[in-house]
């Protein structure tokens, strides 16, 4: 079996002239292509992998939402020579439906990494964007995380930063077929320069309460009991399990397959940095 082979980060790697073909190992009888597109309120980008696959032919599409970060994953496997270049890599399924330029900034600023390399998305070097409230949702948190796509024995990953709807999420994630979008949220302008090792507690969680020491007593006793009328103490955990996606259809149009133009299909390049506020 012969398959197309490429790895795309943002809009480089699977551009038309850079396509490769590979002969698959004996016993490998499917070609695979996987595309994962991510949209923040300030732009979108995609990751893609093409190559020799494993398993059975078929398709698997999924839409995901992580605190207002949208993801759309398409995985396709096929059993013919060079059949794995059918998916559109331009992320247009995630184009916003309405004109959101009417939304004013809400006062919060975040570092934004939309299709930037890991080198360009370090510390305070990425561009700063002004958050705004969109589609009846308040975007007052900042996010720092990663998107990872695995297919054809290849893993490709890019950082993601931007404005989100949650200010306190800790190591949250959503997953799809061979795809993970995960990270943490924070409160306050430009707070998302590096959230890899940080833990946040929501003000909705009752605070830790220091219990008073036991009263001195003249009665010899092997046990001492103290009581408190304060709020119960929650166990403090630095990590929390990955929640199941709260919504498989985050926005109208995200579930359906990427739209096609009438022109010859353009397989290369993600449509990156298209601002939802334009």
């Amino acid at each position: 079996l012969e398959c197309y082979s490429c790895v795309q980060k943002a809009d480089d790697g699977c551009s038309p002239n850079k396509m490769k073909t590979v002969k698959c190992a004996p016993g490998v009888d499917v070609c695979t292509e996987a595309v994962g597109a991510v949209e923040t309120i300030h732009g979108q980008f995609s990751l893609a992998v093409r190559g020799c696959g494993s398993g059975l032919p078929g398709k698997n599409d999924r839409g995901l939402d992580l605190h207002g970060l949208l993801a759309f994953i398409q995985l396709q496997q096929c059993a013919q020579d060079r059949c794995n270049a059918k998916l559109n890599l331009t992320s247009r399924a995630l184009d916003p439906a309405g004109n959101e330029s009417a939304y004013p900034p809400n006062g919060v600023e975040c570092y934004s990494c939309v299709g930037l390399s890991r080198e360009a998305c370090q510390g305070t070097s990425p561009p700063v964007v002004s958050c705004y409230n969109a589609s009846d949702h308040v975007y007052k948190g900042c996010f720092d995380g990663n998107v990872t796509l695995t297919a054809a024995n290849v893993t490709v990953s890019l950082p993601v930063r931007g404005c989100v709807q949650d200010e306190f999420c800790t190591r949250d994630g959503v997953t799809g077929p061979g795809f993970t979008l995960s990270g943490s949220c924070c409160q306050g302008s430009r707070c998302n320069s590096d959230l890899r090792n940080k833990t946040y507690f929501s003000p909705r969680i009752p605070p830790l309460v220091r219990l008073p020491p036991p009263e001195p007593t003249t009665v010899a006793s092997t046990t001492s009991v103290t009581t408190s009328t304060s709020a119960p103490v929650r166990p403090t955990s630095t990590t929390k399990p990955m929640p199941a996606p709260t919504s498989q259809t985050p926005r109208q149009g995200v579930e359906h397959e990427a739209s096609r133009d009438e022109e010859p299909r353009l397989t290369g390049g993600a449509a990156g940095h298209q601002d939802r506020s334009n």
């Epitope: 943002a10 038309p16 002239n17 396509m19 133009d261 010859p264 390049g269 993600a270 449509a271």
Partner: antibody, heavy 117, light 112 residues
Framework: EVQLLESGGGLVQPGGSLRLSCAAS????????MSWVRQAPGKGLEWVSY????????YYADSVKGRFTISRDNSKNTLYLQMNSLRAEDTAVYYC??????????WGQGTLVTVTS | QSVLTQPPSASGTPGQRVTISCTGS?????????VHWYQQLPGTAPKLLIY???KRPSGVPDRFSGSKSGTSASLAISGLRSEDEADYYC???????????FGGGTKLTVLG
């Protein structure tokens, strides 16, 4: 119908500058990788530069690196090539080309750049 | 000197079959990058003839075919016609140069 129309060519002295434009129509320009390819008189094709759909990824041929700058304005459906420090060997017809099916599937008619003293 | 090597000229009589070769290296054709072929008629812009090693865009006659093996590719034209007289270029991506590369071109002459 896909159309690519180059303009901005002309006569320039060595060391001078020119800016070429390529107006695109008939397709979704913002989704297409674009290139400039040149052809010196009586010679073969030489790829010059390459820009991704968003403009964030750019490649240049070694022969023009540091002198030429490719850019695009997706709102105007226009591709540009800023050429500085021009040399006699840059004399050529400059074509803009669209990437479609793994190749340059549409080409403009070209604009002639002549560098001479 | 071009990165991809083509014979400078080729010729044939009407009805004949002609083959044009394109030899690359391990950083382009040998690296697995697909090969494209362009036809340039006198005084006109190049036109895509074969893409993805052996596929024809709509409108290109099936007399034109492409193939690729190892670090080489070839273009075959069967049932040669006078209107096939043109320059033919192969092209591929090159890993080492990080750019597209063309062959030097082959001038095809249809005799008689």
């Amino acid at each position: 119908e896909v159309q690519l129309l180059e303009s901005g060519g002309g006569l320039v002295q060595p060391g001078g500058s020119l800016r070429l434009s390529c107006a695109a129509s008939g397709f979704t320009f913002s989704n297409a990788w674009m290139s400039w390819v040149r052809q010196a008189p009586g010679k073969g094709l030489e790829w010059v530069s390459y820009i991704s759909s968003s403009g964030s990824t750019i490649y240049y041929a070694d022969s023009v690196k540091g002198r030429f700058t490719i850019s695009r304005d997706n709102s105007k459906n226009t591709l540009y090539l800023q050429m500085n420090s021009l040399r006699a060997e840059d004399t050529a017809v400059y074509y803009c080309a669209r990437e479609g099916l793994w190749a340059f599937d549409y080409w403009g008619q070209g604009t002639l750049v002549t560098v001479t003293s | 000197q071009s990165v991809l090597t083509q014979p400078p000229s080729a010729s044939g009589t009407p009805g004949q079959r002609v083959t044009i070769s394109c030899t690359g290296s391990s950083s382009n054709i040998g690296a697995g990058y697909v090969v494209h072929w362009y036809q340039q008629l006198p005084g006109t812009a190049p036109k895509l003839l074969i893409y993805d090693n052996n596929k024809r865009p709509s409108g290109v006659p099936d007399r034109f075919s492409g193939s690729k093996s190892g670090t080489s590719a070839s273009l075959a034209i069967s049932g040669l016609r006078s209107e096939d007289e043109a320059d033919y270029y192969c092209a591929a991506w090159d890993d080492r140069l990080n750019g597209a590369v063309f062959g030097g071109g082959t001038k095809l002459t249809v005799l008689g």
